[in-house]
Interface confidence: medium
């Protein structure tokens, strides 16, 4: 079975200081799947952020950078210049 495990349950981020979110794929090679990132905000709305390769949700391309780390089997999402509007719960997912 495939398992996607986040690096941290909570990530403290400073405004304007780049932050990195990571998910580890266990049980399979991450290169065999497409990685997706979503953000859930207070209203329980799930918003699409990123999908391999280089597909971004509206308004996310300028401040987010998605990638995979094949060497360590990680999905990576970088928030380039975090602001208060980036608060929320971030989810990684995969599909074929």
């Amino acid at each position: 079975a495939i398992e996607l495990v986040p690096e941290h349950q909570t990530v403290p981020v400073s405004i304007g200081v780049p932050a990195t979110l990571r998910c580890s794929m266990k049980g399979e090679a991450i290169g065999n799947y497409y990685i997706n990132w979503y953000r859930k905000t207070q209203g329980n709305t799930m918003t699409f952020i990123y999908r391999e390769k280089d597909i971004y949700g509206p308004g996310f391309k300028d401040n987010f950078q998605g990638d995979i780390d094949i060497a360590k089997n990680l999905a990576v999402l970088k928030i380039l210049a975090p602001s208060e509007r980036d608060e929320g719960s971030y989810y990684c997912a995969c599909d074929t």
Epitope: E7, V17, P18, T20, R22, S24, K26, D67, D69, I70, A71, K72, N73, L74
Partner: antibody
Framework: QVTLKESGPTLVKPTQTLTLTCTFS??????????VGWIRQPPRKALEWLAL???????HYSPSLKSRLTITKDTSKNQVVLTMTHMDPVDTATYYC????????????WGQGTLVTVSS | QLVLTQPPSVSAAPGQKVTISCSGS????????VSWYQQLPGTAPKLLIY???RRPSGIPDRFSGSKSGTSATLGITGLQTGDEADYYC????????????FGGGTKVTVL
């Protein structure tokens, strides 16, 4: 508590093969994401990355030394072994093994290093 | 074959601030996280900063890191005599297969 210790010969002759062993404790090289790398430092010079092996046996080598290097692991003994062929006096250096952080490409724990001198 | 460029030396008086630059390319620093190491004389390197700006537990907040484009910077404030050491930047290069790269090192001297 993570510890690593390098062992091997302190003196090798030119053209010989160097075999270094890194014996570690405090982590397992079967744990997802874990890697052990080798880095060397010639006297009064900079650090130079040599090789790295992962929990899943994936191996990575410095392009300039790839033909001379082999890295292997023995998870039952908690050891990583580096062999380097055709040793030359310019390979005289302190050789370190180090643990790579589970989530990133940085070395968070290092061995004390072992000085290897290549001379006839 | 150093692909990360650092100044050979920097110096400052106790209590002052020093910054060390590390310049790379799009395939290493530009696309990956940077780490910094402190090497006191006669000892093994020690991790100071990882993920560009994060400190391992036990590292004082006098040490800070940042990254912009293809360059990274290490800052040391409130310089102390015990900070006299060599400092190395490191990242990995994902242009071909994964390879790890170090800078040439910077000697920090406390005047």
């Amino acid at each position: 508590q993570v510890t690593l210790k390098e062992s091997g010969p302190t003196l090798v002759k030119p053209t010989q093969t160097l075999t270094l062993t890194c014996t570690f404790s405090g982590f397992s090289l079967t744990t997802h994401g874990v890697g052990v790398g080798w880095i060397r430092q010639p006297p009064r010079k900079a650090l130079e990355w040599l090789a790295l092996i992962y929990w899943n046996a994936d191996k990575h080598y410095s392009p300039s030394l790839k033909s001379r290097l082999t890295i292997t692991k023995d998870t039952s003994k908690n050891q990583v072994v580096l062999t380097m062929t055709h040793m030359d006096p310019v390979d005289t250096a302190t050789y370190y093994c180090a643990h790579e952080g589970d989530w990133g490409h940085y070395f968070d724990f290092w061995g004390q290093g072992t000085l290897v001198t290549v001379s006839s | 074959q150093l692909v990360l460029t650092q100044p050979p030396s920097v110096s400052a008086a106790p209590g002052q601030k020093v910054t060390i630059s590390c310049s790379g390319s799009s395939s290493n620093i530009g696309n990956n996280d940077v780490s910094w190491y402190q090497q006191l004389p006669g000892t093994a390197p020690k991790l100071l900063i990882y993920d560009n700006n994060r400190r391992p537990s036990g590292i004082p907040d006098r040490f800070s890191g940042s990254k912009s484009g293809t360059s990274a910077t290490l800052g040391i404030t409130g310089l102390q005599t015990g900070d006299e050491a060599d400092y190395y930047c490191e990242t990995w290069d994902s242009s071909l297969s994964a390879i790890w790269v170090f800078g040439g090192g910077t000697k920090v001297t406390v005047l």
